[in-house]
């Protein structure tokens, strides 16, 4: 992926739009489309001042780990959907899109250097508090977390990283 493609705001906005679309679709289905189990996902809440005041290395860890956890969660839901006959096929399309989107975002962030920043210097990773997580038991909640993660931590991190790259 071109190193700074993620710095074009339209790129991230496209993924955010896809995530919101999926969230809206799943809001309409019975019980938010139950997954039948609890899937661990990153907590997407942001104390804005705390985020802005903590170091970039810590942000990188949070975003990189969060993205990995979300990717695992989406793959797990994909597997659960494949084994379910109750859920409409259109949902499968949204999950597939999200899986593909998370792969692309991971590549885009790797190109931006988030992976390097997340592991070096080592003290950044060790001093970072363990990633806060929550449980998602419906597709609706999973897509909401996905959408919030992109709109919140991911967008904040890429904004900072892209600004640093401009200097």
């Amino acid at each position: 992926a071109p190193a700074r493609l993620i710095c074009d705001s339209r790129v991230l906005e496209r993924y955010i739009l896809e995530a919101k679309e999926a969230e809206n679709v799943t809001m309409g289905c019975a019980e938010g489309c139950s997954l039948g189990e609890n899937i661990t996902v990153p907590d997407t809440k942001v104390n804005f001042h705390h985020w802005k005041k903590s170091e970039a290395g810590r942000h990188a860890v949070e975003v990189w780990q969060g993205l990995a956890l979300l990717s695992e969660a989406m793959l797990r839901s994909q597997a659960l959907l494949a084994n379910s006959s109750q859920l409409p096929e259109t949902l499968q399309v949204h999950v597939d899109k999200a899986v593909s989107g998370l792969r692309s975002l991971t590549s885009l962030l790797r190109a931006l250097g988030v992976q390097k920043e997340a592991v070096s210097p080592p003290e950044a990773a060790s001093s970072a508090a363990p990633l806060r997580t929550v449980a998602a038991d419906t597709l609706c909640k999973l897509f909401r977390i996905y959408s919030n993660f992109l709109r919140g931590k991911l967008k904040l991190y890429t904004g900072e990283a892209c600004r640093r790259g401009d200097r």
């Epitope: 997407t44 809440k45 942001v46 104390n47 804005f48 001042h49 705390h50 802005k52 005041k53 909401r144 919030n148 709109r151 919140g152 967008k155 904040l156």
Partner: antibody, heavy 117, light 108 residues
Framework: EVQLVQSGAEVKKPGESLKISCKGS????????IGWVRQMPGKGLEWMGW????????RYSPSFQGQVTISADKSISTAYLQWSSLKASDTAMYYC??????????WGQGTLVTVSS | SYVLTQPPSVSVAPGKTARITCSGD??????AYWYQQKPGQAPVLVIY???KRPSGIPERFSGSNSGNTATLTISRVEAGDEADYYC??????????FGGGTKLTVLG
């Protein structure tokens, strides 16, 4: 002890300009942001904006963007809120507050601004 | 822009539990903050990050936040708790939004 001391009450005429101040002491001024909050007579709190004195980053509430200017002088640990042309509807109590991970954890005593012809 | 809605007033007898609610679209996805303001005074932060208490705030004050609603709970209410209470939240963009405020009246 953390203290935010605001400038005194002001009585102004419509169309006049004004700059009120908020001086921080008892803490590292550049390690925290300063937020400004409006409270019109008998009404609730309205967030106007915040400034990071260290990076000079400012964010305005959409409702106040273009209506006021927020600034800071870190050399004297002071934040400012100013108007270029006051309106009668700007009559209110204006509070500054320190913004930390515990947002708006310390407040100034407030500056009452009265705009009347 | 994001809107937080609070009931204009809540009444409670001394010694009882007061619950003040704050609702906003998917508020549970954001941190909630609560402030107490007594007449003629500046506001005071009583709860931050949904449920944490700043030092000096009594344990009687607690907070929760899920779905579309954040709740400030004041147990064993005292006459001195009578005040206006405001909820607030950070948006992902860095805006800080206050609710309209709730007047807590302690009866008797």
């Amino acid at each position: 002890e953390v203290q935010l001391v605001q400038s005194g009450a002001e009585v102004k005429k419509p169309g006049e300009s004004l700059k009120i101040s908020c001086k921080g002491s008892g803490y590292s001024f550049t390690s925290y942001w300063i937020g400004w909050v409006r409270q019109m007579p008998g009404k609730g709190l309205e967030w106007m904006g915040w400034i990071d004195p260290y990076r000079s980053e400012i964010r305005y509430s959409p409702s106040f963007q273009g209506q006021v200017t927020i600034s800071a002088d870190k050399s004297i640990s002071t934040a400012y809120l100013q108007w270029s042309s006051l309106k009668a509807s700007d009559t209110a109590m204006y509070y500054c507050a320190r913004v930390s991970s515990e947002p708006f954890d310390s407040w100034g005593q407030g500056t009452l601004v009265t705009v009347s012809s | 822009s994001y809107v937080l809605t609070q009931p204009p007033s809540v009444s409670v007898a001394p010694g009882k539990t007061a619950r003040i609610t704050c609702s906003g679209d998917k508020l549970g996805d954001h941190y909630a903050y609560w402030y107490q303001q007594k007449p003629g005074q500046a506001p005071v932060l009583v709860i931050y990050d949904d449920s944490k208490r700043p030092s000096g705030i009594p344990e009687r004050f607690s907070g929760s936040n899920s779905g579309n609603t954040a709740t400030l709970t004041i147990s064993r209410v005292e006459a001195g708790d009578e005040a206006d209470y405001y909820c607030a939240t950070w948006t992902f963009e860095g805006d800080y939004v206050f609710g309209g405020g709730t007047k807590l009246t302690v009866l008797g």
